[in-house]
């Protein structure tokens, strides 16, 4: 698969081929992976890929299947990219100001808050 | 500050907060500090609190600026447990699966992706 | 493509007020902030500030600030710029530029708007 | 306010020639500068950021280098279409101010 696909185009047909092989996936009975509580899916990425991580030890691999999770690392390598893009740029205290005022206002709206 | 007001309210006042408080926070001109590119928020919080670390250690404190670092290390708090729920619970994979698809629909239609 | 593409040139009163706009397509426009620059005939470029759709932030430059308004439509993504108490010295090519991430460099503009400002 | 200062002004250069390009900040601005071209009635077009990042699609005869207060455009061996002015832009802090620009002409 070449990285240069668009990162959208990928994450379409990675959701294509998780129910493509759904049955596959589900085979194993026993096995148990942690699945987060909440719905901020951002703040549990590690976790996510630690769990495709042990889908993937424990999945016949061949055909299509290996594609998936091909396609799942790619958008791994996709989200590490981003998260060494949180601490590049040194900025001034005015940037960072709007950018957490950006934040909290999202929070504000758009995250999923327990009272 | 009781940690018992709900985060939502607490994130409101503190956005007051950071208003008011602006001239202040903006006196140190050298300072700088880690500014994300994008708008993918939540893969951020750990510099976003970093950085507010290092404003307060930079900031002269006393009255309402104190409530407001105080709002924020509160906010910190909430993060950290939600992030703690990304791993606790060990679910059968076919519950890993709606998660891992549910990741991936909001990616697809929420996240900031650059082509 | 990604484009941002202006309002047509306008001609006012001294007094009166002037909206260009700057409507966005090719892209997700709360994702990129919206810059407005302008020009004076023969003159260089200066910035008189920044919106951000996401959450309609704006930042001004101090000397257009009580002029300039910056707002955005989002569900047309277009993007404005009101400029009130129009003087001669406000005679210049308005651009709008998107900013390619948080507070960087503008990577596309807007053609321009010209805007005379005569008696 | 960061004051941008340009030099030259102007320039006549011919085709094939290398030309150099300054600008100076008032202040440090560590490496948030980019480089834009204008051609007459034309909308201006970022060439460079961050001071040496050459934007896609930008001809690899421009390059940008500099940080603090001090940097340089330089086009390697200029072409009939770079005839145009010049502009350097801090967006290291608010107000962005711009360098008063450098019109390139042919001698």
């Known amino acids: 698969i070449p990285t240069e696909i668009p990162t959208s185009a990928l994450v379409k047909e990675t959701l294509a081929l998780l129910s493509t092989h759904r049955t596959l996936l589900i085979a194993n009975e026993t096995l148990r992976i942690p699945v987060p509580v909440h719905k901020n899916h951002q703040l549990c990425t590690e976790e996510i890929f630690q769990g495709i991580g042990t889908l993937e030890s424990q999945t016949v691999q061949g055909g299509t299947v290996e594609r998936l999770f091909k396609n799942l690392s790619l958008i791994k390598k996709y989200i590490d990219g981003q998260k060494k893009k949180c601490g590049e740029e040194a900025r001034r205290v005015n940037q960072f100001l709007d950018y957490l005022q950006e934040f909290l206002g999202v929070m504000n709206t758009e995250w999923i808050i327990e009272s | 500050i009781p940690t018992e007001i709900p985060t939502s309210a607490l994130v409101k006042e503190t956005l007051a907060l950071l208003s008011t408080h602006r001239t202040l926070l903006i006196a140190n001109e050298t300072l700088r500090i880690p500014v994300p590119v994008h708008k993918n928020h939540q893969l951020c919080t750990e510099e976003i609190f970093q950085g507010i670390g290092t404003l307060e250690s930079q900031t002269v404190q006393g009255g309402t600026v104190e409530r407001l670092f105080k709002n924020l290390s509160l906010i910190k708090k909430y993060i950290d447990g939600q992030k703690k729920k990304c791993g606790e619970e060990a679910r059968r994979v076919n519950q890993f699966l709606d998660y891992l698809q549910e990741f991936l629909g909001v990616m697809n239609t929420e996240w900031i992706i650059e082509s | 493509q990604v484009q941002l593409v202006q309002s047509g040139a306008e001609v006012k009163k001294p007094g009166a007020s002037v909206k260009v706009s700057c409507k966005a397509s090719?892209?997700?426009?709360?994702?990129?902030?919206i810059n407005w620059v302008r020009q004076a005939p023969g003159q260089g470029l200066e910035w008189i500030g920044y919106?951000?759709?996401?959450?309609?932030?704006?930042r001004y430059n101090q000397k257009f600030k009580g002029r300039a308004t910056l707002t955005v439509d989002k569900s047309t993504s277009t993007a404005y710029m009101e400029l009130s108490s129009l003087r001669s010295e406000d005679t210049a090519v308005y651009y709008c530029?998107?900013?390619?991430?948080?507070?960087?460099?503008?990577?596309?503009w807007g053609q321009g708007t010209l805007v005379t400002v005569s008696s | 306010d960061i004051q941008m200062t340009q030099s030259p002004s102007s320039l006549s250069a011919s085709v094939g020639d290398r030309v150099t390009i300054t600008c100076k900040a008032s202040?440090?601005?560590?490496?948030?500068l980019s480089w834009i071209q204008q051609k007459p009635g034309k909308a201006p077009k970022t060439l460079i950021h961050?001071?040496?990042r050459l934007i896609d699609g930008v001809p690899s005869r421009f390059s940008g280098s500099g940080s603090g207060q001090d940097f340089t455009l330089t086009i390697s061996s200029l072409q009939p279409e770079d005839f145009a002015t010049y502009y350097c832009?801090?967006?290291?802090?608010?107000?962005?101010?711009f360098g008063q620009g450098t019109k390139v002409e042919i001698k």
């Open positions: 530029a998107r900013d390619y991430g948080n507070f960087w460099y503008f990577d596309v």
């Open positions: 090719g892209y997700t426009f709360t994702n990129h902030h």
């Open positions: 919106i951000n759709p996401y959450n309609d932030y704006s």
């Open positions: 202040q440090d601005i560590n490496s948030y």
């Open positions: 961050r001071a040496d």
């Open positions: 832009l801090q967006y290291d802090d608010f107000p962005y101010t």
